[in-house]
């Protein structure tokens, strides 16, 4: 058993049929010694008396808010949550496995630049009685500060018969050094509580590996005289790190016909313009990637050929 | 060329070669199917590699003030990785294929380090750790970790030379 926060405790349980459970001793936070009784949740059934209460925690029915009283007055509360371990593996029932980039990916994180600011998100099908708490640091043995805001519900989607909820959080490294080569990964820890179930999820990454630039901006076409060719031009996204002579991007320009089956023409360039042939009913798209480190490509910015 | 006395390197040549290094480092390190490198105890193998850190003057401001600190750190790293790629970790079993990008990477590391430091000048270099795993699979794992950290190192070096070529070239 360990304390998650004031008056909230997590009981770690090996979860299998007929498991013995954990013996837990609760102590009433009061100078009083006599006439103390204990109840669980809204029930008025007295579970025991005295300053301490010893219980055997085996299942969710044994978890909940234990309250000690004296003469009708509440003295203190202890909320017990359960953390299940099945076959040596902690349960991951609350969050959905996003399976990208690999199985057992519950948290996904992205950064738009090297400033030390990043966003993480996760998915769940649970809509109520759900709380999240996020902590983060750079390195684990001698951790350096990363400040995270509160996790918020950022999207709702319908997937088949199920509703899926996306939560996200923004974090900022306290003293980021954008030009340095990271040697210690960022660690992100999410505590998730659904009703009386506790779970924790972690992710470890370097900012460089989660970089995904915003799409190029101001995408424009300029027809070239007496030719089917056009000059495509664009600019670095505003959110990308500066100066651009140091934090450089590379670009992919794609000409795509109306039909998905039509052959795509692609050009790769380090410049912010390119000359391509504009086919009728086609569209031109451009996306960006860090020039020197192969992290994610941005989403496409597109304009129609016409 | 960057020499301890402080003259300027051939920024444009360094830029081209460092960008080639980035491409080669990514060709040489495919995503590893069944090895999750972070779970395989990175600390003992990659703590010893030279990293370009915050105080090394490799940021745009630091380069403008005095690029020598940064160039020395990059040179140190290039020599370190060049030695690693020429060591038993990479020459042992499983053998490199004749046209492996690793071979070209090794040659390019040497090329860039020589551009930064002509014969006769000596910057201090770091000892390479004596890592010589006996099993091929351990060697393979170590190769992936080294290439992974090399990708990060050459990315910073390439940014430095690109910025230098754009803003510091005579």
């Amino acid at each position: 058993i360990w304390e998650l926060k004031k008056d909230v405790y997590v009981v770690e349980l090996d979860w299998y049929p007929d498991a013995p459970g954990e013996m837990v001793v609760l102590t009433c936070d009061t100078p009083e010694e006599d006439g103390i009784t204990w109840t669980l949740d809204q029930s008025s059934e007295v579970l025991g008396s005295g300053k301490t209460l010893t219980i055997q925690v085996k299942e969710f029915g044994d978890a909940g808010q234990y309250t000690c009283h004296k003469g009708g007055e509440v003295l203190s509360h202890s909320l017990l949550l359960l953390h299940k371990k099945e076959d040596g593996i902690w349960s991951t029932d609350i969050l959905k496995d996003q399976k990208e980039p690999k199985n057992k990916t519950f948290l996904r994180c992205e950064a738009k630049n090297y400033s030390g600011r990043f966003t993480c998100w996760w998915l769940t099908t649970i809509s109520t009685d759900l709380t999240f708490s996020v902590k983060s640091s750079r390195g684990s043995s001698d951790p350096q500060g990363v400040t995270c805001g509160a996790a918020t519900l950022s999207a709702e989607r319908v997937r088949g018969d199920n509703k899926e909820y996306e939560y996200s959080v923004e974090c900022q490294e306290d003293s980021a050094c954008p030009a340095a080569e990271e040697s210690l990964p960022i660690e992100v820890m999410v505590d998730a509580v659904h009703k009386l179930k506790y779970e924790n999820y972690t992710s470890s990454f370097f900012i460089r590996d989660i970089i995904k630039p915003d799409p190029p901006k101001n995408l424009q076409l300029k027809p070239l005289k007496n030719s089917r060719q056009v000059e495509v031009s664009w600019e670095y996204p505003d959110t990308w790190s500066t100066p651009h002579s140091y934090f450089s991007l590379t670009f992919c320009v794609q000409v795509q016909g109306k039909s998905k089956r039509e052959k795509k023409d692609r050009v790769f360039t380090d410049k912010t313009s390119a000359t391509v042939i504009c086919r009728k009913n086609a569209s031109i798209s451009v996306r960006a990637q860090d020039r020197y480190y192969s992290s994610s490509w941005s989403e496409w910015a597109s304009v129609p050929c016409s | 060329r960057a020499v301890p006395g402080g003259s300027s390197p051939a920024w444009t040549q360094c830029q081209q070669l460092s960008q080639k290094l980035c491409t080669l480092a990514w060709s040489a390190h495919p995503l590893v199917g069944h090895m999750d490198l972070r779970e395989e105890g990175d600390e003992e193998t990659t703590n010893d590699v030279p990293h370009i850190q915050c105080g090394d003057g490799c940021d745009p401001q630091g380069l403008r003030d005095n690029s020598q600190f940064c160039l020395q750190r990059i040179h140190q790293g290039l020599i370190f990785y060049e030695k690693l790629l020429g060591s038993d970790i990479f020459t042992g079993e499983p053998s490199l294929l004749p046209d492996s990008p690793v071979g070209q990477l090794h040659a390019s590391l040497l090329g860039l380090s020589q551009l930064l430091q002509p014969e006769g000048h000596h910057w201090e270099t770091q000892q390479i750790p004596s890592l010589s795993p006996s099993q091929p699979w351990q060697r393979l794992l170590l190769r992936f970790k080294i290439l992974r950290s090399l990708q990060a190192f050459v990315a910073v070096a390439a940014r430095v030379f690109a910025h230098g070529a754009a803003t510091l070239s005579p």
Partner: antibody
Framework: QVHLVQSGAEVKKPGASVKVSCKAS????????INWVRQAPGQGLEWMGW????????DYSQHLQGRVTMTTDTSTNTAYMELRSLRSDDTAVYYC?????????????WGQGTLVTVSS | EIVLTQSPDFQSVTPKEKVTITCRAS??????LHWYQQKPDQSPKLLIT???QSFSGVPSRFSGSGSGTDFTLTIHSLEAEDAATYYC?????????FGQGTKLEIK
């Protein structure tokens, strides 16, 4: 998820040629090599050759030299194996399998196989 | 070229039995030997890499050992689904070669 998907079964006459394709997905194609392995009915595995998708360099089994050509198309992440002057003993299931483009390595994953039948 | 010789060629075994398949190389190949399992009408599947390393997702009953010229694949407690042909493969020197295969039948 890494996948190699091969083209469908072929029936050829002796003396003809066959070209089998192997489309890769789920990984950086140019950072690996593709091996071709064949298996005659009821027999074991026979390595035919290897191509680096990084450099295009090839190595062929000595006794197929001159009859086999391996190529890659990095724009479509596809590897091809062409076998010419087919004989009846070329009847086999042909597999493509991924290995490193850096060092001598194991094969994983394998394509589903393409049955080539050579019969007059 | 390096010749890999497996033994036995065929083995009929009962579930829960321990099975040992050996692979001998005609010259030293260090640790560059891999094992594959092939079930009827399926592609080969990688089991063990570099003589002793279990590949991802492979049941723990499969293990490998050996180096130099003599290698062993062990199935510690055979299950019905292990009925297949097992091949060793060397990646030490081109041309890559395979053993002739060992067919395991479940009694």
């Amino acid at each position: 998820q890494v996948h190699l998907v091969q083209s469908g079964a072929e029936v050829k006459k002796p003396g003809a040629s066959v070209k089998v394709s192997c489309k890769a997905s789920g990984y950086t194609f140019s950072s690996y090599g593709i091996n071709w392995v064949r298996q005659a009915p009821g027999q074991g595995l026979e390595w035919m050759g290897w191509i680096s998708a990084y450099s295009g360099n090839t190595d062929y089994s000595q006794h197929l030299q001159g009859r086999v050509t391996m190529t890659t198309d990095t724009s479509t992440n596809t590897a091809y194996m062409e076998l010419r002057s087919l004989r009846s003993d070329d009847t086999a299931v042909y597999y493509c399998a991924r290995a490193s483009a850096n060092w001598y390595d194991y094969f994983d994953p394998w394509g589903q196989g393409t049955l080539v039948t050579v019969s007059s | 070229e390096i010749v890999l010789t497996q033994s036995p060629d065929f083995q009929s075994v009962t579930p829960k039995e321990k099975v040992t398949i050996t692979c001998r190389a005609s010259q030293t190949i260090g640790g560059s030997l891999h094992w594959y399992q092939q079930k009827p009408d399926q592609s080969p599947k990688l089991l063990i890499t570099y003589a002793s390393q279990s590949f991802s997702g492979v049941p723990s009953r499969f293990s490998g050992s050996g180096s130099g010229t003599d290698f062993t694949l062990t199935i510690h407690s055979l299950e019905a689904e292990d009925a297949a042909t097992y091949y060793c493969h060397q990646s030490s020197i081109l041309p890559y070669t395979f053993g002739q295969g060992t067919k395991l039948e479940i009694k």
